[in-house]
């Protein structure tokens, strides 16, 4: 069976301040079992934007129903975008582990740029 791939189809997304940004991500397989997370930036200093497993992320909604059986779409929408939200967003698949989940594979990233709010 082919190994899971993380698909982020857009290289870049541009959104006006105050609007919502949709960041698209999908998996090619349901295996391995484990959550997905979204981060802004890469490396040790990356910022957690969304965790499928736990946490409260008031500005983030999932585009499709993540609890739906066989769902492979892990796209998110971030509301009320500000210039501070600019950066590169990574969709990351984790493999279920004990005691901690282990990072399995990351998407290529989508750069979010923020335009000035139309006057």
């Amino acid at each position: 069976e082919d190994e899971l791939q993380v698909i982020q189809p857009e290289k870049s997304v541009s959104v006006a301040a105050g609007e919502s940004a949709t960041l698209r991500c999908a998996m090619t397989s349901l295996i391995p079992v484990g959550p997905i997370m979204w981060f802004r930036g890469a490396g040790a200093g990356r910022e957690l934007i969304y965790n499928q497993k736990e946490g409260h992320f008031p500005r983030v909604t999932t585009v499709s129903e993540l609890t739906k059986r066989n769902n492979l779409d892990f796209s998110i929408s971030i509301s009320n975008i500000t210039p501070a939200d600019a950066g590169t967003y990574y969709c990351v698949k984790f493999r279920k582990g004990s005691p901690d989940d282990v990072e399995f594979k990351s998407g290529a990233g989508t750069e979010l740029s923020v335009r000035a709010k139309p006057s």
């Epitope: 082919d2 698909i7 189809p9 857009e10 290289k11 090619t28």
Partner: antibody, heavy 125, light 107 residues
Framework: QVQLVQSGAEVKKPGSSVKVSCKAS????????ISWVRQAPGQGLEWMGG????????NYAQKFQGRVTITADESTSTAYMELSSLRSEDTAVYYC??????????????????WGQGTTVTVSS | DIQMTQSPSSVSASVGDRVTITCRAS??????LAWYQQKPGKAPKLLIY???SLQSGVPSRFSGSGSGTDFTLTISSLQPEDFATYYC?????????FGGGTKVEIK
């Protein structure tokens, strides 16, 4: 070898709709990006929109927003483009083309490397 | 939407000539640009992707360069089969957009 085979030529009346199909063979259809591009007689290429079946939703060029609907049926590996409220300026050759997918490492910016044969749509009263 | 402007709109050249076509994006697109060749009555053919990567099977006389907003397609020594129309396309962000095309004609 991946192929895209489109439905045949259509003649339509102004105000009506047309639905063109594009059947893919080979490759993993769900992760391909299928774009629709049109070319009016003597004119350049226009990207109308595209869909990646695994996501379900399509992206559209602003010019066609509200008038074009792009869908995909994973069970038959077929993409569809429906254009409504047809006018004479919609007379063109309509192409489907693929990018991304497993063959490219899921890189959708690697260009549209396989094209359908084109479908001529003529809008005339 | 990102606008793509190609120049010239047409060029007359002879076999063996070096031909250069330019494409400018209305905003930065990194190197996410493709070039296509189209002959009358035929579907377009992908020549170059990621601004400078040659598509498999395309002759090495075709080359691409550039990043950001300014890009170039060069045919180093024009062959009879190269007389066609060439289009650039940005694939950085949706909606993808094409340039207006450059027709390479026989002088």
């Amino acid at each position: 070898q991946v192929q895209l085979v489109q439905s045949g030529a259509e003649v339509k009346k102004p105000g009506s709709s047309v639905k063109v199909s594009c059947k893919a063979s080979g490759g993993t259809f769900s992760s391909l990006a299928i774009s629709w591009v049109r070319q009016a007689p003597g004119q350049g290429l226009e990207w109308m929109g595209g869909i990646i079946p695994i996501f379900g939703t399509a992206n559209y060029a602003q010019k066609f927003q509200g008038r074009v609907t792009i869908t995909a049926d994973e069970s038959t590996s077929t993409a569809y483009m429906e254009l409504s409220s047809l006018r004479s300026e919609d007379t063109a050759v309509y192409y489907c083309a693929r990018s991304g997918g497993d063959y490219s490492g899921y890189d959708y910016a690697s260009g549209m490397d396989v094209w359908g044969q084109g479908t001529t749509v003529t809008v005339s009263s | 939407d990102i606008q793509m402007t190609q120049s010239p709109s047409s060029v007359s050249a002879s076999v063996g000539d070096r031909v250069t076509i330019t494409c400018r994006a209305s905003q930065g697109i990194s190197s996410w640009l493709a070039w296509y060749q189209q002959k009358p009555g035929k579907a377009p053919k992908l020549l170059i992707y990621a601004a400078s990567s040659l598509q498999s099977g395309v002759p090495s006389r075709f080359s691409g360069s550039g990043s950001g907003t300014d890009f170039t397609l060069t045919i180093s020594s024009l062959q009879p089969e190269d007389f066609a129309t060439y289009y650039c396309q940005q694939v950085n962000s949706f909606p993808w957009t094409f340039g207006g095309g450059t027709k390479v004609e026989i002088k």
